[in-house]
């Protein structure tokens, strides 16, 4: 987290607010739930208090405009800048300004009022940008999801920073951004994508590029806004420029940002049996065509040319890969060789000898 | 309806530089990814450079660090700088909004000769 120069900060805890126009994408009353649920993110995690006035002079103006709207930072029409807040001062302190041109909602189309809002109020009360991509003062947009909103660790420590604790948080998870250099850090999966390599934890991914140490972390939501926030398996099917993310019962097909139309499916429309839950771990072998399904302790290979479930299987994993354990979380191939994820741990595997060549932290794909 | 036009394209020495544009027609460009493929004669069509609706870019490992793709909203444009081009870099590059599923310019030939 950051917080402003001088450490700008209110005095009091008590702040009011004003909605002095309305934007025509939504009604009032969706505005005000908005704008009410976006103060209560912070008032959660500090002792704040907020309360709304109609009319007069508040802490907080909240207004929409489009362009020049009278405080020399204009808006720039369609997306680009989509809102600004003043940091805690007098006049125009704390005051957030909303871009008109922008098309706000209550969903994941257009932007979504309540996150943009959340954002703006945390500029309102002291916070600058945070570095980290999983914060709500990340300075890109991402819409988060349906599912109810938590705020990120790092915001919460950046604004206790400043007014210290509530009495009592009423959600006290709040997601961490995971370490690469965790020596406990296990992964979720691994893919190739046109020659970076993607790894999967939580609701982020690091990217990779070759020849390349450091690793740049995105929320999964960033690329990918209509997939879920977590996946359980993932491969690449270069030739035909596709990767497929697997996550529950359901699978998706992705060419670079964008989902293949007919997608999500259902993994039983692969030829795995109904009582598979989840695929765990899964890899793309281009010499031939085939790719490992792993699931709980069993492994399954699917032909992808033929769009057909080998027979004989599924095996179990112990069996095929003897030593690499009887789960897998994540896998990929590179070079000839298999390397297996199981917790913290990762197996290099060699195709060639079918057996174990190297045991090393899974952690060490970060270069760490 | 998206249409897509290409311009840019052209003959250049090995170690010149291009920009290719992209004409969008249709008020819901902004709401696709923009990318560029390209295809060399008698070669299968491949990805050259991508941005994200969130402007987040992904290159082909053999252009990365020589073409950038940007794309402006307002103006319906998107463009591809094309640095330090390479004999290899010649082919016709095809503009595409949505994806392998989505919408396709005709295409703009490069020629780069050493």
């Known amino acids: 987290y950051n917080v402003f120069p001088r450490t700008l900060k209110w005095s009091k805890m008590n702040l009011t607010y004003r909605i002095v126009n309305y934007t025509p994408d939504m009604t009032h009353s969706e505005v005000e739930k908005a704008f009410k649920k976006a103060f209560k993110v912070w008032s959660d995690v500090t002792p704040l208090n907020f309360t709304r006035l109609h009319d007069g002079i508040a802490d907080i103006m909240i207004s929409f405009g489009i362009k020049e709207h009278g405080d020399f930072y204009p808006f720039d029409g369609p997306s680009g800048l989509l809102a600004h807040a003043f940091p805690p001062g007098p006049n125009y302190g704390g005051d957030a300004h909303f871009d008109d041109d922008e098309t706000w909602t209550s969903s994941s189309k257009g932007y979504n009022l309540f996150l943009v809002a959340a954002h703006e109020f945390g500029h309102s009360l002291g916070l600058d940008h945070s570095k980290d991509p999983g914060a709500l003062m990340f300075p890109i947009y991402t819409y988060t999801g349906k599912s109810h909103f938590m705020l990120p660790d790092d915001d919460v420590q950046g604004i206790q920073s400043l007014y210290g604790p509530g009495d009592e948080d009423p959600n006290p998870k709040h997601p961490k951004t995971p370490d690469k250099c965790d020596p406990s850090l296990s992964l979720d999966a691994i893919t190739s994508l046109r020659g970076e390599t993607m790894i999967f934890k939580d609701r982020f991914f690091w990217r990779l590029h070759p020849q390349q140490v450091d690793a740049e972390l995105f929320l999964t939501k960033s690329f990918w806004p209509e997939l879920p926030n977590r996946i359980d398996a993932a491969y690449e099917h270069p030739s035909h420029d596709l990767i497929f993310i697997f996550r529950g019962r359901k699978f998706w097909a992705l060419n670079g940002y964008d989902i293949l139309e007919g997608y999500p499916k259902k993994i039983s429309e692969l030829g795995l049996p109904k009582e598979v839950k989840k695929i765990s771990a899964a890899v793309h072998f281009e010499d031939t065509g085939k790719t490992l399904l792993f699931s709980g302790n069993q492994v399954w290979r699917y032909d992808d040319t033929n769009h057909i479930m080998d027979k004989d299987y599924p095996r179990l994993i112990e069996e095929d890969f003897p030593g690499i354990g009887d789960k897998v979380d994540a896998v990929y191939e590179k070079n000839g060789y298999i390397y297996f994820f199981n917790g913290p741990i990762q197996f290099e595997y060699s195709i060639w000898s079918n057996r174990i060549v190297r045991v090393m932290p899974a952690n060490s794909i970060l270069w760490c | 309806e998206v249409q897509l036009v290409e311009s840019g394209g052209g003959s250049v020495q090995a170690g010149g530089s291009l920009r290719l544009s992209c004409a969008a027609s249709g008020s819901t460009f902004s709401r696709y990814s923009m990318n560029w493929y390209r295809q060399a004669p008698g070669k299968q069509r491949e990805f050259v450079a991508g941005?994200?609706?969130?402007?987040?870019?992904n290159y082909a490992v053999s252009v990365r660090g020589r073409f950038t793709i940007s794309r402006d909203n307002a103006e319906g444009t998107g463009y591809l700088q094309m640095n330090s081009l390479k004999p290899e870099d010649t082919a016709v590059y095809y503009c595409n909004a949505g994806g392998l599923q989505g919408y396709w310019g005709l295409g703009t030939l490069v020629t780069v000769s050493s």
């Open positions: 941005i994200s609706v969130g402007r987040i870019t």
